[in-house]
């Protein structure tokens, strides 16, 4: 997996009015690290492990940033022509990438009213529209109103995703999101009988990274997709992650039935307490 | 704990321009939020006057903004209101208060009476 | 601008009693509201952000509702330290606003 940095940005009008402020969120290597306050009117850590590593330089610098993107995102949201009445949003979702070879990628894309109409390369200024006649016409309004902007030239781009992949590798080199393993805790819980079955739930936590294998086995052999409910993979807030598998079995038959995990290489089966 | 106290002449004639003080005491203004002019006239009426942010942007009430100026002096911790070519109908008790959108902290007020 | 109206000025209400004072904006605001209470001679005192978050050290008996246009600051069991004018204010978009203001007695 690619180390990544991605800013998420949102803002609303209601009736023709582009509210003051914006929302945004940033997250490293997919775990949130920074939300924009707006009462403080700042970007502040997200996460003890994102405010213990970074320093105070790092949310000045975010805060000037995201203020100067809000601020883009909400002239832009002023310019979209479609506007009806009620609530409307506009979304930017930035990202850029350091692979294993270290080959980058940048790109941005956005959404109006939760919908995606136009995404961006910055490294090559390509830009790709949805097929749908809405987001088309979405994606040339906001165009031409970048066209009309001086700033918005090449450069600009190219410095975006520069910029992006400055603060990624910074944060890196803090240690933030260094390439480390956190086994899973892994914890198996039985809930009340119901009609002779009881369900069991195997739940792992605090692990990273993100991927991770979860399922429930009977006399050694994986239970079928359908037979098995599985958690989404979250994360905890302490740059790690948490999920669970639960499933159905009859009353008495727990000692058939266990828990296999396999996180970065390494495996365990847990059994169904008596 | 966060502390405003605004300070003022109390009494200025017409035309005039009227300066206030915000004098903030257990928080720098310049770590964040926004530092915020609040007037309430005779009548109770509230009225948001605009602030300098923790930054030194500055945003203005439009109904103000040819006559408002808000700046400040970050090495005292103090930001200041003026106001220019005042008339009778700006009478009203000045409140700073701190906030980006809601206000949490606030002066205790200043009353200011316009009158020749 | 977004006008806040506080269609009553005044209310009248029992001790213990239970009271609503209502906002409604121009514009939909989108729970970007606040409330405030304000005692003779003092500053106006934050009671609650976004529509309905209490703010810290202020009493449970207050509450706020509402969406959209309208809004509602409750009050339950009052009490005598609760006589006072409330204001609604927003911070939807600039120039924030505030009602004209309700002034709670005791009856």
């Known amino acids: 997996e690619p180390h990544s940095l991605r800013y998420n940005l949102m803002v609303l009008s209601q009736d023709g009015s582009v509210q003051s402020g914006f929302l945004a969120e940033g997250h490293l290597d997919g775990q949130p690290f920074l939300r924009y306050d707006r009462q403080k009117r700042r970007a502040k850590p997200q996460g003890q492990w994102a405010e213990n590593v970074l320093g105070a330089k790092t949310w000045d610098t975010e805060t000037e940033d995201l203020t100067e993107n809000g601020q883009d995102l909400r002239r832009t949201l002023t310019h979209i022509k479609d506007q009806k009445g009620g609530l409307h949003s506009l979304q930017e979702i930035r990202v850029c990438e350091i692979h294993e070879d270290s080959s980058t990628r940048g790109s941005r894309h956005f959404y109006y009213d939760g919908e995606l109409f136009l995404s961006q390369n910055l490294e090559t200024q390509e830009s790709t529209v949805p097929q749908s006649s809405r987001a088309q016409t979405l994606a040339m309004n906001v165009t031409n109103f970048w066209k009309e902007d001086a700033m918005k030239t090449k450069t600009h781009y190219r410095a975006m995703q520069a910029d992006c992949l400055q603060k990624l590798q910074r944060y890196l080199k803090s240690g933030v999101a260094i390439r480390r393993t956190v086994p899973p805790m892994v914890n198996v819980t039985c809930s009340e009988v119901s009609e002779g079955n009881i369900t069991v739930t195997c739940r792992a936590s605090s692990f990273y990274p993100r991927n991770i294998t979860l399922t429930w086995r009977q006399d050694g052999v994986s239970l079928s997709h359908n037979t098995q409910q599985w958690g989404d993979v979250l994360p905890d807030g302490n740059g790690t992650y948490q999920t669970w598998v639960a499933t159905r079995i009859r009353q008495g038959e727990e000692q058939r039935f266990t828990c296999y995990m396999e996180h970065s290489g390494n495996h365990g089966t847990h059994p169904v307490p008596s | 704990e966060v502390q405003l106290e605004e300070s003022g002449p109390g009494l200025v004639k017409p035309s005039q321009s009227l300066s206030l003080t915000c004098t903030v005491t257990g928080y720098s203004i310049t770590s964040d939020y926004a530092w915020n002019w609040i007037r309430q006239f005779p009548g109770n009426k509230l009225e948001w006057m605009g602030y300098?942010?923790?930054?030194?942007?500055?945003n203005y009430n439009p109904s103000l903004k040819s006559r408002i100026s808000i700046t400040r002096d970050t090495s005292k911790n103090q930001f200041f209101l003026q106001l220019n070519s005042v008339i009778t109908e700006d009478t009203a008790t000045y409140y700073c208060a701190r906030g980006g959108t809601y206000f949490d902290y606030w002066g205790q007020g200043t009353t200011l009476t316009v009158s020749s | 601008d977004i006008v806040l109206t506080q269609t009553t000025s005044y209310l009248s209400v029992s001790l213990g009693g239970r009271v609503t004072i209502a906002c409604k904006a121009s514009?939909?605001?989108?729970?970007?509201l606040a409330w405030y209470q304000q005692k003779p001679g003092n500053a106006p005192r934050l009671l609650i952000s976004d529509a309905t978050s209490l703010e810290t050290g202020v009493p449970s008996r207050f509450s706020g509702s509402g969406s959209g246009k309208d809004y509602t600051l409750s009050i339950t069991s009052l009490q005598t330290e609760d006589v006072a004018t409330y204001y609604c204010q927003h911070y939807w978009s600039t120039p924030w606003t505030f009602g004209g203001g309700t002034k709670l007695e005791i009856k």
């Open positions: 300098i942010s923790y930054s030194g942007s500055t």
């Open positions: 514009a939909h605001i989108n729970n970007w």
